[in-house]
Interface confidence: low
Amino acid sequence: LSCHFPRRPAYGDVTVTSLHPGGSARFHCATGYQLKGARHLTCLNATQPFWDSKEPVCIAACGGVIRNATTGRIVSPGFPGNYSNNLTCHWLLEAPEGQRLHLHFEKVSLAEDDDRLIIRNGDNVEAPPVYDSYEVEYLPIEGLLSSGKHFFVELSTDSSGAAAGMALRYEAFQQGHCYEPFVKYGNFSSSTPTYPVGTTVEFSCDPGYTLEQGSIIIECVDPHDPQWNETEPACRAVCSGEITDSAGVVLSPNWPEPYGRGQDCIWGVHVEEDKRIMLDIRVLRIGPGDVLTFYDGDDLTARVLGQYSGPRSHFKLFTSMADVTIQFQSDPGTSVLGYQQGFVIHFFEVPRNDTCPELPEIPNGWKSPSQPELVHGTVVTYQCYPGYQVVGSSVLMCQWDLTWSEDLPSCQRVTSCHDPGDVEHSRRLISSPKFPVGATVQYICDQGFVLMGSSILTCHDRQAGSPKWSDRAPKCLLEQLKPCHGLSAPENGARSPEKQLHPAGATIHFSCAPGYVLKGQASIKCVPGHPSHWSDPPPICRAASLDGFYNSRSLDVAKAPAASSTLDAAH
């Protein structure tokens, strides 16, 4: 019996140690989103095990203060869905000491009425505005730079109309360095990680996207005022294209943003002459007046493989030849304006015979097929070099329809250390939840325990292999402290144990002779310290009342030997 797998929060993630009782689930949010609810859930034992709390959600907060802002993003409430009306959100970004900020406009989509975005070069609402959506028709593609360590961002919306709002990316950068570049729907590689003068950065787009504007390679220049010599490019899903890759992606124009109305797009996909093409239509959400047509050949007079309007779930098509023409016509009259409305088509070159298509090598890894011929049933296993981990399925199987059971995996650089774990009798302070390179974990021992080892661990990158902690996790050992000296038993009372010295942490108990009541603490503890000391003064035994006193005395006489021996032991 186990707990159900916890729901992954939208715009966040969950990692689960175990679904069995005692197992835990940790939640964290994507940058720009904040966790609402418990960060950590535990699976409790019961006839039907259950999580000790409700799954949290990730929300985009309306404003906030981000101190020590290194890299991240701020997003408007509801993003990428629409924001709500009558908002006034203020964000204060503060870079680490001695650093400045750069802002990238990842997306700004405001309703055309009185919704407004203002960015101020300072730390308060009166600081000078460096961007005002009222005054600027086009977003500055090169972004904004702060002159000090602050940016103050204001988003205000009125009572009518709503739109997707905004996503702004921020990067702090040091004096003498350029800011970290950014390309939406793409990637970049850098010659150095901190972008000093002389750094070159090369951009590439995700499959299905095309580099537009700017330059593919940019360089950090000018030691006096470091800056990129060109604007960063943009990656966009374009309308039409000729593709000659053996595998790739065709996206609806502007994906994942909505495509425009009245569009007429034609893509030609061409593979090697003796091959054919498998089209894997993973997303198809178009309007009823829009048409997506697949032609089995290299022009629009070829046989129609399929023609689709409206939404449809995942399906595949196979061409009979080495060319396919994809045509998309959107209704000029109406438009489907939702996010992720459009289509995502993956295509693969496949042989015409009885084998699955040859699988490519993957960067930073290798493949090992179960047999040389890629016939039905063949299994190919992908593995990664040290320092990289498989993303996706590492095992692919050639299926009966001569397609691979899974998408091609990739080898991703391991950019974080494993969780070093908790140390008994301590608490820990973590600089970053996923332990990226540069993250620190500080262990602080509980009172009465001393640290053996390093109190701060730092995650370091390595040339070969995965990042590694600077040291082993420490231990918290019980402090060897001086004992407390024994206390006398109270008059007409007793104590146990009857030692002269009591170790730190020990407890002694007091009791009174019959007819007496204890005034004070019945148990007191030897509190560890320098020196160790008793937690309370010793109690006293007081006669309960005069009647009680005489009654107890007569009882004492009646059982004199026992009573006197007790009293003797107490002195």
Partner: antibody, heavy 116, light 107 residues
């Protein structure tokens, strides 16, 4: 702004070859195909083919296969077309034009004269 | 190959006059037609794509339309800059094919 600058006029002997160029500027060269068109004196236009500079994929009009060879140099954002085994039939103005939905922009043309 | 038949091959008209040029496709081209203008100095400019979409910078007096396999270019009121050669081009199928052209002259 987008510009396609073609090379100057060529005078060639029958049987020889000529190579003309079309230099693109004002846009990302690899994002669009480049088409070539022929126009004989006083006649209409004929499509020769196109090249996709990002992949070097070419598509020829059957009529010009073996006659024309299209190439592209990404580093200089220049498309080239070579005509071989020239005859008087090849005397014409040759235009380059930018795709994808073709011919949004045109070069000014290169005049090729084949004469003994 | 798809044949594009353009008519008339030449046309004389006066300033301010309305003129129409036509292209007929031998096969279905689904509106994938371009209209081009070639000036006497050889300069070529695209006026219309997708049969009726005006390119930016093209005056509103120019329009394109379709009726079945017939495609028309209309200039509602001729100006001096409009006297030139006009070609249609289909881009539905390879090889791309042009119409024979129309010479528009000042009467």
């Amino acid at each position: 702004q987008v510009q396609l600058q073609q090379s100057g006029a060529e005078l060639a002997r029958p049987g020889a070859s000529v190579k003309m160029s079309c230099k693109a500027s004002g846009y990302t060269f690899t994002s669009y195909t480049m088409h070539w068109v022929k126009q004989r004196p006083g006649q209409g236009l004929e499509w020769i083919g196109y090249i996709n500079p990002s992949s070097d994929y070419t598509k020829y009009n059957q009529k010009f296969k073996g006659k024309a060879t299209m190439t592209a140099d990404k580093s200089s954002s220049t498309a080239y077309m070579q005509l071989s085994s020239l005859t008087s039939e090849d005397s014409a103005v040759y235009y380059c034009g930018r795709g994808l939905v073709p011919f949004a922009y045109w070069g000014q043309g290169t005049l090729v004269t084949v004469s003994a | 190959d798809i044949q594009m038949t353009q008519s008339p091959s030449s046309l004389s008209a006066s300033l301010g006059e309305r003129v129409s040029l036509t292209c007929r496709a031998s096969q279905e081209i689904s509106g994938y037609l371009i209209w081009l203008q070639q000036k006497p100095d050889g300069t070529i400019k695209r006026l219309i794509y997708a049969a009726s979409t005006l390119d930016s910078g093209v005056p509103k007096r120019v329009s394109g339309s379709r009726s079945g396999s017939d495609y028309s270019l209309t200039i509602s009121s001729l100006e001096s800059e409009d006297f030139a050669d006009y070609y249609c081009l289909q881009y539905a199928s390879y090889p791309l094919t042009f119409g024979g052209g129309t010479k528009l002259e000042l009467k």
